[in-house]
Structures are given as structure tokens and as C-alpha cells.
């Protein structure tokens, strides 16, 4: 079982390989000096049907370096960064993992593109492995809350309450959504 020639790349090079390309072979892409690699640099020859070989993902692309490009902080609810830090310049990558009891959909890594957007795929999503969700929490008088998303919230996520100036928060500041679909505490109050 072998793979066909790896997909070509403009303004870059492909690592050495011999033919036939055996299943398990890795080929690596790199870009010329004034270009930046967007996407996974390594492709793996795999077989899905034990008959034909295929490359496990599309080839990356080489974008002409844009020194003015910068990308916003990427947010993945239920996830966290395991690689990458600000400032995010053209060609920089960020890799995510999901919190406990969350599973990832999509590609774990994204790259800062010349157009100031993350790509070449969408940001991954972290989906709760529990079907239960906690109901939306109420706003509180003289205060507000922040949550990583609106409406019902998946287990493992939290809501943080704060009070307006001149008011004191009484109760729990951070309330966690438990795997049971219940909140870890009742909402606090804001008192003068």
C-alpha cells in the first residue's frame, strides 16, 4: 500500500521522500525565507481501507510575510491554550486542548494568517461529554455576571459575578456548572 505524490506547495519545499511512498511515511513542508507556513507542516501517508494509501490532511500553504499582520486572542470555550502567546504575528500558531470532561472537534492548531484571521481551519470547539447543561443564571441587582457563552452552560464552565462600584458581593464570586447539570452555589447578592 502506498501514497501518490504529496500535494505540491507554492513558494516552499517538500522534504525528501522515496517512491513508492509507504504507509507511515511522513513528509514535511517548509516555506522560502519571505513566506510563512499556514497549516500543519507534516503530512502522514495512511490507509483507510487497507487497499489504497492517502495523505491524512491537506497540504499547508506558504503566504508572503506580512509584517503588519496580527491576530486577536483566540477563545475556545471549554478549552485552553497549550502553545502560543501574544502578540500573534503572521505565521504564529496556537494549539488548544480541552478541559476535563470536554472533547475536541476540529483541528487543535490554528495559524495567524496574512488577513489577520486564524486559519486555515476554524477554531476548534470543546464539547461537553455530558449531555446535561446548567440553566442560564440570573443577573443580580446592582451587579452583573460574565460567562464564556450565553444561555445554558456546559459542565466544567463557570460564571463570575461582580458588583457595581459601591456595592459589596455577598456569597460566591465564581459559580461552577457541575456534571450533574446543577450549579455549585446560588447566585450571590450585591449589598451596599
Amino acid at each position: 500500500i502506498s501514497c501518490g505524490s504529496p500535494p505540491p506547495i507554492l513558494n516552499g519545499r517538500i522534504s525528501y521522500y522515496s517512491t513508492p511512498i509507504a504507509v507511515g511515511t511522513v513528509i514535511r513542508y517548509s516555506c522560502s525565507g519571505t513566506f510563512r507556513l499556514i497549516g500543519e507542516k507534516s503530512l502522514l501517508c495512511i490507509t483507510k481501507d487497507k487497499v489504497d494509501g492517502t495523505w491524512d490532511k491537506p497540504a499547508p500553504k506558504c503566504e508572503y510575510f506580512n509584517k503588519y499582520s496580527s491576530c486577536p486572542e483566540p477563545i475556545v470555550p471549554g478549552g485552553y491554550k497549550i502553545r502560543g502567546s501574544t502578540p500573534y504575528r503572521h505565521g504564529d500558531s496556537v494549539t488548544f486542548a480541552c478541559k476535563t470532561n470536554f472533547s475536541m472537534n476540529g483541528n487543535k492548531s490554528v495559524w495567524c494568517q496574512a488577513n489577520n484571521m486564524w486559519g486555515p481551519t476554524r477554531l476548534p470547539t470543546c464539547v461537553s461529554v455530558f449531555p446535561l447543561e446548567c440553566p442560564a443564571l440570573p443577573m443580580i441587582h446592582n451587579g452583573h455576571h460574565t460567562s464564556e457563552n450565553v444561555g445554558s452552560i456546559a459542565p466544567g464552565l463557570s460564571v463570575t459575578y461582580s458588583c457595581e462600584s459601591g456595592y459589596l458581593l455577598v456569597g460566591e464570586k465564581i459559580i461552577n456548572c457541575l456534571s450533574s447539570g446543577k450549579w455549585s452555589a446560588v447566585p450571590p447578592t450585591c449589598e451596599e
Epitope: S15, V26, L44
Partner: antibody
């Protein structure tokens, strides 16, 4: 950090086989590749082959083709290297080493297993 | 197989001084090169990957450079714990190691 723990030292007769294990803990066993690298006494490092556990694909260095078999048990997060038709030149420390995804370089290494081939 | 050649075989340097280790590839390997440190009785430890990126937890005194066929590992100010054997490894086409450079105290 992923920890790789290998089986204990072995003494073998020429012509026999040896099977060394490498148990991984921490991280996701399916998200990395395990290579086997050996080091003869006072010598350098020599790559033998590697397996991608999630795919069950193993590839071998030309020198060891037909004599080495690398396998992995996903249920126990353990990789194995079996070397057959042993000869005295196979006396070495055998290491398992982990590469994240298919990065090509080894972030984590086992402690090594000394295999002595002697009559 | 891509043959990797390291030089010198042994390098004698005094603590506090700079050490420069070389690695040559038999054919172009772009920047697909890693450096490892190995102390007696221990497994190798990753220092540098992609020719110049420092691995997690590796002190800034270790730096790597080069591309194509010529690569260098530099240790800017040698500490007592840096005396060991150093290996380069290519991953352009499968994997292969250099024969090692022993860094010893002068």
C-alpha cells in the same frame, strides 16, 4: 510531560529473541508516535523503527527490516519491540522515545533496557 | 539513510567558556534537525528542535543555528552540568543520528 517506563534488563542467548516493553503514562497515547533507538556500549544512537499506535502502522530502518517487530497495545498504552535472531552485536541499551504527533524529534525517552546477548 | 557527521569527536573547554559543536548532513535537511544531551547512564534529553527552537525548560545558554547541511549547537557559558555527550538527529527523511561529540572539561 509523558513518562515512559521500560521493562527490565534481559540476558539472551545468540539466535533467540527478546521483547522489550514501554508503558506510557500522561498525555494521550493515540496522539503520538513511539520510536525505538538503541545504543551499543560506548557507541552512538541508532534508530530502529517506530509505530503510530492509533493507526497501528510500524516502519523500520533498513538495517533491522525482517528482524524487528514493533507493536502497540492501545488499551494499556504500551509499545513493544521484539528483536529476533540475536547476535552478540545486538548487546545494547534499547530506548523507547516519544514524538508528539509526528514532529520528528523526541520529547520524552524511556529509562532504557539493557539487553545482553551472550552464550 | 541520511548520514549525519558530527565534529569534533571530543571537545575540551573550560567552564565559563563558549562551546561550539558542529553537525553536517549528507544531503539538505532544511531545518529538520534536533540536538540532544546525554549524560552517563541516562537517556538522551531534547535540547533543540527545528534547528534553532529551544525545548521546554532548556536554559537560554543553549542555542542552535543552521539550515541545509551545516548546523551548529552553541553553549554560551559552560556550566559544570553541561559536560556530556551531544547528538544531532535529522528528521527530513525518516530518522538518523550523528555519532556524537563528547564535551569534556579542559
Amino acid at each position: 510531560q509523558v513518562q515512559l517506563v521500560q521493562s527490565g534488563a534481559e540476558v539472551k542467548k545468540p539466535g533467540s529473541s527478546v521483547k522489550v516493553s514501554c508503558k506510557a503514562s500522561g498525555g494521550t497515547f493515540s496522539s503520538y508516535a513511539i520510536s525505538w533507538v538503541r545504543q551499543a556500549p560506548g557507541q552512538g544512537l541508532e534508530w530502529m523503527g517506530r509505530i503510530i499506535p492509533i493507526l497501528g502502522i510500524a516502519n523500520y530502518a533498513q538495517k533491522f527490516q525482517g528482524r524487528v517487530t514493533i507493536t502497540a497495545d492501545k488499551s494499556t498504552s504500551t509499545a513493544y519491540m521484539e528483536l529476533s535472531s540475536l547476535r552478540s552485536e545486538d548487546t545494547a541499551v534499547y530506548y523507547c522515545a516519544r514524538e508528539e504527533d509526528i514532529s520528528g524529534y523526541y520529547q520524552d525517552w524511556g529509562q532504557g533496557t539493557l539487553v545482553t546477548v551472550s552464550s | 539513510e541520511i548520514v549525519m557527521t558530527q565534529s569534533p569527536a571530543t571537545l575540551s573547554v573550560s567552564p565559563g567558556e563558549r562551546a561550539t559543536l558542529s553537525c553536517r548532513a549528507g544531503q539538505s535537511i532544511s531545518r529538520y534537525l534536533a540536538w540532544y544531551q546525554q549524560k552517563p547512564g541516562q537517556a538522551p534529553r531534547l535540547l533543540i528542535y527545528d534547528a534553532s527552537s529551544r525545548a521546554t525548560g532548556i536554559p537560554a545558554r543553549f542555542s542552535g543555528s543552521g539550515s541545509g547541511t551545516e548546523f551548529t549547537l552553541t553553549i554560551s557559558s559552560l556550566q559544570s552540568e553541561d559536560f556530556a555527550v551531544y547528538y544531532c538527529q535529522q528528521y527530513e527523511y525518516w530518522y538518523s543520528f550523528g555519532q556524537g561529540t563528547k564535551l569534556e572539561i579542559k
